[in-house]
């Protein structure tokens, strides 16, 4: 079982534990070995104390366990004799946030440890490029995040503040859209979403390449490179090439780094180079026709980054075709 947790030690027998929504966590507690062990884990809110898990007289005692913890908690029973009173906590919810006290009594002494549990969520955000009529928009979206993240935008590496924020989920987790109107701009844009609790940051970068003018029947090379500043060598990522047409995106090619598999949805599409170094994902589109004119979007995404590169291709009739008309 993978347990996402950060341990922070603060004074007075108090620890801060950070877990992720829906995942499992261990609330740590240790004591000096002794006989006649009694363990009580309790949750304390502003008004009440709730029984989370109890152990005494040699077994777990769940008669008075609060229903919200049913089938979600257990102790490491084989390790109690070695001084381990830690609580294994399954399927964290945001309602589990708060102060937990672990009481341990033995024939020799009694101690109380306090654990502050904080729960975060950061489902991978995404950056989308949308065209609505004649307007172009960049949208930074995070489907599920808690606590509220810090969202910052940059244009050509300079911070900007004008963006339209939409938020749903009054208590959390939140779903957040931050939209920027980039109509007519050739600048590069960057959106950063930071979850301070989970110490997790995601960045989306959008770059508009110079327009490409090609003749019918020619081929075009569309560049898209993975920037090493953004991606670490062992990080899984995916590359999607798509075409934007009348506000609708259709996928042309898809590559997954974990399996190194490519799927092409357009037979005239191919990689510019062999994907040996997994950094250059430039594409060739052959045998251009007039209907190939439009915007081509390369999306390289990992858990931490999305790099969007836009190419505008203008396909013009060849001389022969023009004279035929």
């Amino acid at each position: 079982i993978f347990l996402s947790a950060f341990f922070t030690y603060v004074p007075m027998n108090e620890q801060i534990i950070i877990g992720r929504l829906g995942e499992d966590i261990i609330l740590p507690s240790s004591f000096e070995r002794g006989s006649e062990v009694v363990i009580h884990w309790k949750y304390q809110d502003s008004y009440n104390s709730y029984n989370v898990h109890s152990y005494y007289k040699g077994s777990g005692r769940l008669e008075s366990q609060d229903t919200r913890y049913a089938n979600r908690t257990s102790l490491f029973y084989n390790e109690i004799q070695n001084g381990n009173a830690s609580l294994f906590f399954r399927r964290l919810s945001l309602l589990d946030e708060g102060i937990y006290t672990c009481y341990v009594g033995t024939a020799i002494q009694a101690i109380t440890n306090k654990v502050v549990l904080k729960v975060g969520v950061f489902l991978t955000p995404m950056m989308k490029y949308e065209k609505r009529n004649t307007n172009s928009f960049l949208i930074c979206n995070v489907l599920s995040v808690y606590p509220r993240p810090i969202i910052t935008w940059k244009m050509d590496n300079t911070p900007i503040s004008e963006n339209n924020m939409q938020e749903t989920g009054s208590l959390g987790p939140f779903s957040i859209n931050s939209t920027l109107n980039i109509t007519g701009s050739n600048s590069s844009y960057e959106c950063t979403i930071e979850n301070s609790l989970l110490k997790q940051t995601w960045t989306g970068r959008w770059t508009m390449k110079d327009g490409l003018h090609k003749m019918q029947s020619e081929h075009v090379s569309l560049s898209c490179e993975l920037v090493n500043d953004y991606f670490s060598p062992n990080q899984d990522f995916k590359v999607t090439w798509s075409r934007m047409e009348s506000g609708i995106s259709s996928i042309l090619a898809y590559y997954l780094s974990s399996s190194q598999n490519t799927t092409f949805y357009e037979s005239r599409f191919s990689w510019n180079k062999e994907l040996k170094n997994q950094s250059d994902f430039s594409m060739n589109l052959t045998d251009l026709s007039l209907s190939d004119s439009g915007e081509y979007l390369c999306n390289i995404s990992s858990d931490e980054y999305t790099l969007l590169t836009i190419h505008t291709v203008h396909v013009e009739p060849s001389q022969e075709t023009a004279s035929d008309n």
Epitope: S35, E36, V38, H40, K42, S49, N51, S54, Y56, K57, G58, R61, S64, Y103, G105, T106, A107, A110, I111, T112
Partner: antibody, heavy 121, light 107 residues
Framework: QVQLVESGGGVVQPGRSLRLSCAAS????????IHWVRQAPGKGLEWVAV????????YYADSVRGRFTISRDNSKNTLSLQMNSLRAEDTAVYYC??????????????WGQGTLVTVSS | DIQMTQSPSTLSASVGDRVTITCRAS??????LAWYQQKPGKAPKLLIY???SLESGVPSRFSGSGSGTEFTLTISSLQPDDLATYYC?????????FGQGTKLEIK
């Protein structure tokens, strides 16, 4: 050293009320469950009630349930037993006794000297 | 409630004797049994917990054994200071109950 001192005993008429107190010292009061145990003159011991270390759980013997209420004030290191609707059979020396730990174990590592309650008309 | 029955009710023995007191539970209480000593006019004192664990500060001549429903308290060599009434108590479940006591006299 651990000390438990009971007070509040005396003579009371049947049907009346009495409140016993127990002052604790020499240990971290809020870490331990405390019990009341009584002993009728010339008789054996009878467990009366327990309150857990944090006051969250309270349990009573059948003979006193609904008439007696156990409570504690951890800020003052004191335990109380409110006894209502007293009967002649409640006549006894009342001891407060410290549980081995939270109150969940249920045996008594330390005892007070006791306070006598006599219910008589 | 679980009933606890002690035997004998009264026991007379000489200094140096090996003394055994028995306690029987009306149903299994595992090892959740304590023994107390009460001298006249005093509060009880814990001797043994969990059927056989000797409480700190209690002389080693006291020992306990048994599990389930049958338990014994043994004084290996009776001393004059052991004149008292002895009680067993189950703490397996609420309500906690005591045996009726065994009065130990010195011959």
């Amino acid at each position: 050293q651990v000390q438990l001192v009971e007070s509040g005993g005396g003579v009371v008429q049947p049907g009346r009320s009495l409140r016993l107190s127990c002052a604790a010292s020499g240990f971290t009061f809020s870490d331990y469950g405390i019990h009341w145990v009584r002993q009728a003159p010339g008789k054996g011991l009878e467990w009366v009630a327990v309150i857990w270390y944090d006051g969250s759980d309270k349990y009573y013997a059948d003979s006193v349930r609904g008439r007696f209420t156990i409570s504690r004030d951890n800020s003052k290191n004191t335990l109380s037993l409110q006894m209502n609707s007293l009967r002649a059979e409640d006549t006894a020396v009342y001891y407060c006794a410290r549980d081995r730990s939270s109150g969940a174990m249920g045996y008594f590592a330390y005892w007070g000297q006791g306070t006598l309650v006599t219910v008589s008309s | 409630d679980i009933q606890m029955t002690q035997s004998p009710s009264t026991l007379s023995a000489s200094v140096g004797d090996r003394v055994t007191i028995t306690c029987r539970a009306s149903q299994s209480i595992s090892s959740w049994l304590a023994w107390y000593q009460q001298k006249p006019g005093k509060a009880p004192k814990l001797l043994i917990y969990k059927a056989s664990s000797l409480e700190s500060g209690v002389p080693s001549r006291f020992s306990g054994s048994g599990s389930g429903t049958e338990f014994t308290l043994t004084i290996s060599s009776l001393q004059p200071d052991d004149l008292a009434t002895y009680y067993c108590q189950q703490y397996n479940s609420y309500s906690y109950t005591f045996g009726q006591g065994t009065k130990l006299e010195i011959k």
